[in-house]
């Protein structure tokens, strides 16, 4: 058993172009806290799989507000380490994950609101009862510095904390076979670490974290006496009046209470009152739970289904995340149909539809031209989510309800006059143009640039425009 | 100060539906939970199911799947539960409770008065 | 569901004394446990959140033990105002459920 510990020295802008914005201000004072998960092993997990080396939580840093005009500084830490408990061996290689958390401090009645500022991962190897390893790590913008290392709760030792360390029997020599422990030398090294609490009289193991008992004793912790005829005794056999072979234990002898926590009997066993950060009957879990707050952004926290996942947590609807932490883009899977805007509004998604087009998710082609009448003969014509009348002569607008003069544009070219017409107009051309707006100039020898006039109609005679 | 205000009692028949409503104030409405629990008359307490106002997302015992419909209105920070088919069993009084959710916390922190919810013929 | 039993019943106690009540899951609920105090006429109030962790505004006689499946609510020295029924409630999986409550009533 040990315990992980990290302690961050900084969380700030990095170096080089694209400083951050603080993520505190003013209006929205906040304040930083980290979460570290940790896990067994190099392999390349998912930040949602389990952390089945353990979990932990920092207190909260210092209120900060940002000073208007300023750059981020590096922000204020929290105090103290962030220590992970681990039962059973350090397995040497792992894999960490460290978040940077942001709680603001705004007027919210309902609660602080927190979300992720960044996260780091990586994978390293270590052995238990190293010195401090430093480590700098970036997460886009932001720079984050910090140092871990592992060590073993007494009395275990070594690289994997799995060597027992007991203090010397004799004053100038370990056992046979057992070398003194570096560099408590005045300690002896003990063969195998059984499991805690195995007894030291009836037990021993063969693998570490075992606990097999000698002949006539019985119990996960060899403590209890098998007995030869029935035992009366509540509290265990006595040996005078049935036969049994040793006075039973107490329910709390040898203190069943794994990490720390603190055995207290009760009519009909035991009791572990466990320290934060483990739980469980005998104080065996450890990690964060539920009564950690793990969940953020309206996540609701239920157990686990399997031993190993301490907590769940139940993102409502645009969040995912195996704390919730991370706003699902929901835009990305293009929901609005026809060409539609997407919005994430947080609690819900609008479309904003293009003209012609409704429904909330913009599906509905509308009819363009349905309850449309266009005036004065005109007729209707769809047209990209638009309706759009084409007017009879001498009207026009968006209905077809304006008399249209149909002079007013000047179209009669080379100074022509334009007259007008209860069929359109009619261009009055000066000498020396002809045709419908007076567009063609009428050439000396009497010949037109138009193939032929139209019979009736003498060159310099007005030109209908029909 | 934080405040669940509930409508007031309600007498009805066999098979119709009753529609309880929970006026939030206090706090901000929708960033928490609101669950719903019945008390039959002398009896415990039975979890009927949530809804996250924001987005109006529930929770639901799958007894009541199929007779009970949470809705939320955020412009009046109101919830309702209807509760359809009624029978004689669902005789009871009808709390609302705000979830502290903050982290998650899965816990009733404050109720409102209660509804008393009586079917008869 | 998980099945959530308190016990006793019904538990006499004199004021000043010390009560124990008693909660049993029928299967683990981690640390997933929260009790609550009832007095006739009332709603259910917040006492104790995950097993142990107190409530703002809650007397600190109150206090909550155990894990996974057997949970106590202590309350050290008993006042006239404690006297009510008292329901444990688990949250570790859907759907919630409470115990049919202890009324603590006076000796």
């Known amino acids: 058993a040990g315990v992980f510990e990290l302690q961050i020295h900084s969380f700030g802008p990095g170096p080089g172009p694209g400083a951050p914005r603080s993520p505190c201000s003013a209006r929205l004072p906040c304040r930083l806290f980290f979460r570290v998960c940790l896990k067994p092993g190099l392999s390349e997990e998912a930040a949602e799989s389990p952390c089945a080396l353990g979990a932990a939580l920092s207190a909260r840093g210092p209120v900060y507000t940002e000073q208007p005009g300023a750059p981020a500084p590096d922000l204020p830490l929290p105090d103290g380490l962030l220590q992970v408990p681990f039962r059973d061996a350090w397995p040497g290689t792992f894999s960490f994950i460290i978040e940077t958390w942001r709680e603001e401090l705004g007027d919210q009645i309902g609660g602080p609101a927190w979300s992720l500022l960044a996260r780091v991962a990586g994978r390293r190897r270590l052995a238990a009862g190293g010195p401090w390893a430093r480590d700098i790590q970036r997460a886009g913008a932001w720079e984050l510095r910090f140092s871990y290392r592992a060590r073993c709760e007494p009395p275990a030792v070594g690289t994997a904390c799995t060597r027992l360390c007991r203090p010397r029997s004799a004053p100038s020599r370990c056992g046979p076979g057992l070398r003194p422990c570096a560099p408590l030398e005045d300690e002896c090294e003990a063969p195998l670490v059984c499991r805690a609490g195995c007894s030291p009289e009836h037990g021993f193991c063969e693998q570490p974290g075992e606990c097999r008992c000698l002949e006539g004793w019985t119990g996960p912790l060899c403590t209890v006496p098998v007995s030869t005829s029935s035992c009366l005794s509540p509290r265990g056999p006595s040996s005078a009046t049935t036969g049994c072979l040793v006075p039973g234990p107490g329910p709390c002898d040898g203190n069943p209470c794994a990490n720390g926590g603190s055995c207290s009997e009760t009519p009909r066993s035991f009791e572990c009152t466990c320290p934060r950060g483990f739980y469980g009957l005998r104080c065996e879990v450890s990690g964060v739970t539920c009564a950690d707050g793990p969940c953020f952004n309206g996540g609701l926290c239920v157990g686990g289904a399997d031993p190993d996942s301490a907590y769940i947590c139940h993102c409502p609807p645009g969040f995912q995340g195996s704390n919730c932490e991370k706003r699902v883009d929901r835009c990305s899977l293009q929901p609005c149909r026809n060409g539609g805007l997407c919005l994430d509004l947080g609690h819900a998604l609008r479309c904003r539809c293009r003209a012609g087009f409704a429904g909330p998710r913009c599906e509905h082609d509308l009819d363009d031209c349905a309850g449309r009448a266009c005036a004065n003969g005109g007729t209707c014509v769809e047209g990209g989510g638009a309706h759009r009348c084409s007017c009879a002569l001498g009207f026009g607008g968006r209905d077809c309800r304006e008399r249209a003069d149909p002079c007013a544009a000047r179209p009669c070219a080379h100074g022509g006059r334009c007259y007008a017409h209860f069929s359109g107009l009619v261009c009055a051309c000066a000498p020396g143009y002809m045709g419908a707006r007076c567009e063609f100039p009428v050439h000396p020898d009497g010949a037109s640039a138009l193939p032929a006039a139209p019979p009736g109609l003498r060159p310099g005679d007005p030109q209908r425009y029909l | 100060q934080v405040q669940l205000v509930q409508s007031g009692a309600e007498v009805k028949k066999p098979g119709a539906s009753v529609k309880v409503s929970c006026k939030a104030s206090?706090?901000?409405?929708?960033?928490?939970?609101i669950t719903w629990v019945r008390q039959a008359p002398g009896q415990g307490l039975e979890w009927m199911g949530d809804?996250?106002?924001?987005?109006?997302?529930?929770n639901n015992n799958e007894k009541f799947r199929n007779r009970v419909t949470m809705t939320r209105d955020t412009s009046t920070s109101t919830v309702y539960m209807e509760l359809s088919s009624l029978r004689s069993e669902d005789t009871a009084v009808y709390y609302c409770?705000?979830?502290?959710?903050?982290?998650?916390?899965?816990?009733?922190?404050?109720w409102g008065q209660g509804t008393l919810v009586t079917v008869s013929s | 569901e998980i099945v959530m039993t308190q016990s006793p019943a019904t538990l006499s106690v004199s004021p000043g004394e010390r009560a124990t009540l008693s909660c049993r899951a029928s299967?683990?609920?981690?640390?997933?446990l929260h009790w609550y105090q009832q007095k006739p006429g009332q709603a259910p109030r917040l006492l104790i959140k995950?097993?142990?962790q107190s409530i703002s505004g809650i007397p600190a006689r109150f206090s909550g033990s155990g894990s996974g499946t057997e949970f106590t609510l202590t309350i050290s020295s008993l006042q006239s105002e404690d006297f009510a029924v008292y329901y444990c409630q688990q949250s570790n999986s859907w759907p919630l459920t409470f115990g049919g409550g202890t009324k603590l009533e006076i000796k």
């Open positions: 206090g706090y901000t409405f929708t960033s928490h939970w």
């Open positions: 409770a705000k979830i502290i959710t903050v982290g998650g916390a899965y816990v009733m922190d404050y």
């Open positions: 995950y097993v142990s």
């Open positions: 299967q683990s609920v981690r640390n997933n």
């Open positions: 809804i996250y106002p924001i987005s109006g997302s529930t």
